[in-house]
C-alpha cells in the first residue's frame, strides 16, 4: 500500500503568450498521493468549473482558455491540495498579444484654411503599436505644423491648401500592421476676389463688360449688384478653372451705375463673402469712340430727328475723328442739296440718306450696323427720284454737276443686301411702304437699263408692312 505524499508541483507554471481569439494552455503537473484537488485562480479570483470559456482536464492539471480575449491578461495560479501537508501553488502570467487594431479610425474632415485640424487614430495592440500616417502614397513627415500625438492622432496647425488630400493612419507592432481607410482632408478657403471689375466711362448705348475673378474652396459663386439691387439687365458669362471663377457681366449702358461683384462660398452653415465695386459713367456724347469700327448710341442730332425712330440706337463710325458731329455735318449738307429736288423725291431721299448715314444697330456681342435693304434704295433711285437720278448720272457723264443730288452721300444700291434674300439683313424704310400705297402714278423710268432688282416693295398686307409712325423696323 502506497504511503501518503503531500502534493509537489513538478512543472511550475510559465508565462504564456497568446494571441486574441487563439487558445492558451497552462499546465500544472502535480505528484501526490492521494490524488489532489486542483483549483485555478486568475488574479486571485477562483475560476469556476462551469465557466464555459475554460476547459479543465487531466484531473485539473490542464487549464485551457478556449478563445483568448484581451481582458484575459493576468496572473493564473494552480493550487493543489490532497489533505497531506499544506496546499501548494504555482503561478504564471498570461500575456495577451494582439495584432494592431484601430479602434477609432480617422474620418473625413473639412477645415477652413488657417485653423487646426485633428485626425483621430486610436489603436489597440500588444505590444503597443506605433502609429504613423500616410498622405496620398507617401509617408507623412512631421514638421513644426504637423505632429503625430501620443494618442496616435494627427494634428495639423495652421492648415494650408496643400494639406488637402487623402490620409490614412498605420498602426504597427511585432505581430502585424493595420491600416485605416483613406479619409479626405478638405481645406476650405474663404472667398477672395483676385481681379476686381474696372470702372468705365462710356457712351450712352455702349456695351460694357465688367469682369470679376474670385477664388475659394469650395469655388465661390459670383453675383452682381447694380446700385444696391440685383442686376436687372445684361448677360452674365461664367467659367471655372482651377478653383477660380471668372464672371463677366455684359451691360448695355443707358444710365450710370455702381456695379458690385459679390463672391460667396459656404463653409458648413456659414458663408464667407468678398466684394468689389466699379462705376460705369456716361461720357460726353461727342467724346465716345467705342472701338476701331464704331459704336452704337441714340441719335441726338436734329436733321434726321423726324425720320429716325425715337430712342433707336444708330451706328457711329469711328473712322471719323468725331463721328457724331461728322455724320451730322454730312447729313446737314445733304439736306441743303435736297432743296432742289421734287416734292415726290425729297422725303424719300431724306429717308434713304438718314437711314444710310445713321444705320440701325442690331444686337450681338458687338453692336453692328444694318444697311438699308437694296429694294428700298432702288425704290428711291428708280421710282421716287428717277428724274433726279437720271439727270445726275447724265451730268456726271458730261462733267456737269447742277442737279442738287451730286453731293449727296448716296448708297450704291447694288452693294446693299436684298430683303428677299435675307429679310433680317437690312433696314426697311417704312415711309416708302406707306408712300407706295398712296402713289397712283410714278414718273416713267426711261433709263437705258432698268434694274433687274426693280423694287418689289412689300404690300401693306404682307408681314413687311409697317405703320408710317413706326420707322426703322
Amino acid at each position: 500500500e502506497k504511503l501518503p505524499k503531500a502534493p509537489v508541483i513538478t512543472t511550475p507554471l510559465e508565462t504564456v503568450d497568446a494571441l486574441v481569439e487563439e487558445v492558451a494552455t497552462f499546465m500544472c503537473a502535480v505528484e501526490s498521493y492521494p490524488q489532489p484537488e486542483i483549483s485555478w485562480t486568475r488574479n486571485k479570483i477562483l475560476i469556476k468549473l462551469f465557466d464555459t470559456r475554460y476547459s479543465i482536464r487531466e484531473n485539473g492539471q490542464l487549464l485551457t482558455i478556449l478563445s483568448v480575449e484581451d481582458s484575459d491578461d493576468g496572473i493564473y495560479c494552480c493550487i493543489a491540495n490532497n489533505g497531506v501537508g499544506g496546499a501548494v501553488e504555482s503561478c504564471g502570467a498570461l500575456q495577451v498579444k494582439m495584432k494592431p487594431k484601430i479602434t477609432r479610425p480617422p474620418i473625413n474632415v473639412k477645415i477652413i484654411e488657417g485653423l487646426k485640424a485633428v485626425l483621430p487614430c486610436t489603436t489597440m495592440g500588444n505590444p503597443k503599436p506605433s502609429v504613423s500616417w500616410i498622405k496620398g502614397d507617401n509617408a507623412l513627415r512631421e514638421n513644426s505644423r504637423i505632429a503625430v500625438l501620443e494618442s496616435g492622432s494627427l494634428r495639423i496647425h495652421n492648415v494650408q491648401k496643400e494639406d488637402a488630400g487623402q490620409y490614412r493612419c498605420v498602426a504597427k507592432n511585432s505581430l502585424g500592421t493595420a491600416y485605416s481607410k483613406l479619409v479626405k482632408l478638405e481645406v476650405e478657403v474663404f472667398a477672395r476676389i483676385l481681379r476686381a471689375p474696372e470702372s468705365h466711362n462710356v457712351t450712352f448705348g455702349s456695351f460694357v463688360t465688367l469682369r470679376c475673378t474670385a477664388i475659394g474652396i469650395p469655388v465661390p459663386t459670383i453675383s452682381w449688384i447694380e446700385n444696391g439691387n440685383a442686376v436687372s439687365s445684361g448677360s452674365i458669362q461664367e467659367s471655372v478653372k482651377d478653383r477660380v471663377i471668372d464672371s463677366r457681366l455684359q451691360l448695355f449702358i443707358t444710365k450710370p451705375g455702381l456695379y458690385t461683384c459679390i463672391a460667396t462660398n459656404k463653409h458648413g452653415e456659414k458663408f464667407s463673402t468678398a466684394k468689389a465695386a466699379a462705376t460705369v459713367s456716361i461720357a460726353e456724347w461727342s467724346k465716345s469712340q467705342k472701338d476701331s469700327q464704331g459704336y452704337c448710341a441714340q441719335y441726338r442730332g436734329e436733321v434726321c430727328d423726324a425720320v429716325l425712330a425715337k430712342d433707336a440706337l444708330v451706328f457711329f463710325n469711328t473712322s471719323y475723328r468725331d463721328p457724331e458731329d461728322a455724320q451730322e455735318l454730312l447729313i446737314h449738307t445733304a439736306w441743303n442739296e435736297l432743296k432742289a429736288v421734287s416734292p415726290l423725291c425729297r422725303p424719300a431721299a431724306e429717308a434713304l440718306l438718314c437711314n444710310h448715314l445713321f444705320q440701325e444697330c442690331s444686337p450681338g456681342v458687338v453692336p453692328t450696323p444694318m444697311p438699308i435693304c437694296r429694294e428700298y434704295c432702288l425704290a428711291v433711285k428708280e421710282l421716287f427720284c428717277a428724274k433726279e437720278w437720271q439727270a445726275m448720272e447724265g451730268k456726271a457723264h458730261r462733267g456737269l454737276y447742277r442737279s442738287g443730288m451730286h453731293l449727296l452721300p448716296v448708297p450704291e444700291c447694288s452693294k446693299l443686301p436684298s430683303m428677299h434674300r435675307d429679310p433680317t439683313a437690312c433696314t426697311r424704310l417704312p415711309y416708302l411702304d406707306y408712300k407706295k400705297e398712296n402713289i397712283t402714278t410714278f414718273p416713267s423710268i426711261t433709263s437705258s437699263r432698268p434694274s433687274a432688282d426693280i423694287p418689289n416693295l412689300p404690300a401693306s398686307t404682307s408681314s413687311f408692312a409697317v405703320s408710317p409712325a413706326y420707322s426703322m423696323t
Epitope: 448677360s235 443686301p417 435675307d422
Partner: antibody, heavy 115, light 113 residues
Amino acid sequence: EVQLVESGGGLVQPGGSLSLSCVASGFTFSLYYMNWVRQAPGKGLEWLSVIDTHSIAYYADSVKGRFTISRDNVKNTLYLQLNNLKPEDTALYYCVLGRTALVRWGQGTQVTVSS
Amino acid sequence: DIVMTQSPSSVTASAGERVTINCRSSQSVLYSSNQKNYLNWYQQRLGQSPRLLIYWASARESGVPDRFSGSGSTTNFTLTISSFQPEDAAVYYCQQSYKPPYGFGSGTRLEIK
C-alpha cells in the same frame, strides 16, 4: 434663285481634320452673313458659327478652338475647317444664309467621325 | 449663353385643328432699341433641310402660309398653326438670334392623328 451646295464631308478618324465648303449662287455672297449649323443623327439642330460681311466670326462653345469659319467672297464660297474631331461631331452639316434668322439652307454634307 | 426651352416635345393633331408650340428663353431676347424680339421659328420635314417660318417673333417669311403665326415677347413665345394640314407634320424649332451663340430649342415633333 439662292443655292447653297455643301461638300467636303466624309468619314474621318477621331482627332482628324476635315474641310467643308459651301458654294453660294443666286445672290451677292459678300453682302450677307453666313452660318454653319449641324444636326446629329436623330437629334435636333445645333448652331455652330456665323461669319459677318467683314469676316468677323462667332462660335458655339462646343466647337470654339477646334472649328474655323472663313469665306472667300471672290469664289462665293464659305468654309468650315474642322480640327481635332470627336465622335460627337458626327452630323449633317448645313451651310445657311442669314443674319438674325437662318433664311436659306443647303442640303447638308455628312461628317462621320469613327475609328 | 441664352438657353431655349421648347414645349411640348411632341404633339398630335387632326386636320383643321389649332396647334400651339411654346418656347421660352433663359434671358430676354427683346432688343430695346428697335423693340424687336430676336426669336425665329423653323420647320423641318422628315428628310428635308429646315425652313424658316417666322423671324423677329412674329414676321412671317415670304411663301409661308398665313395659318402659321408667331407671338410673344421678351422670354415667352408661341408658334400657332390656326388650322393644321397634313403637310404641316414636321419637327418645329425655335431659335434666338439676340446674341451668339444662337441656340435652338430641342424641337417639337408634330404628327398627324
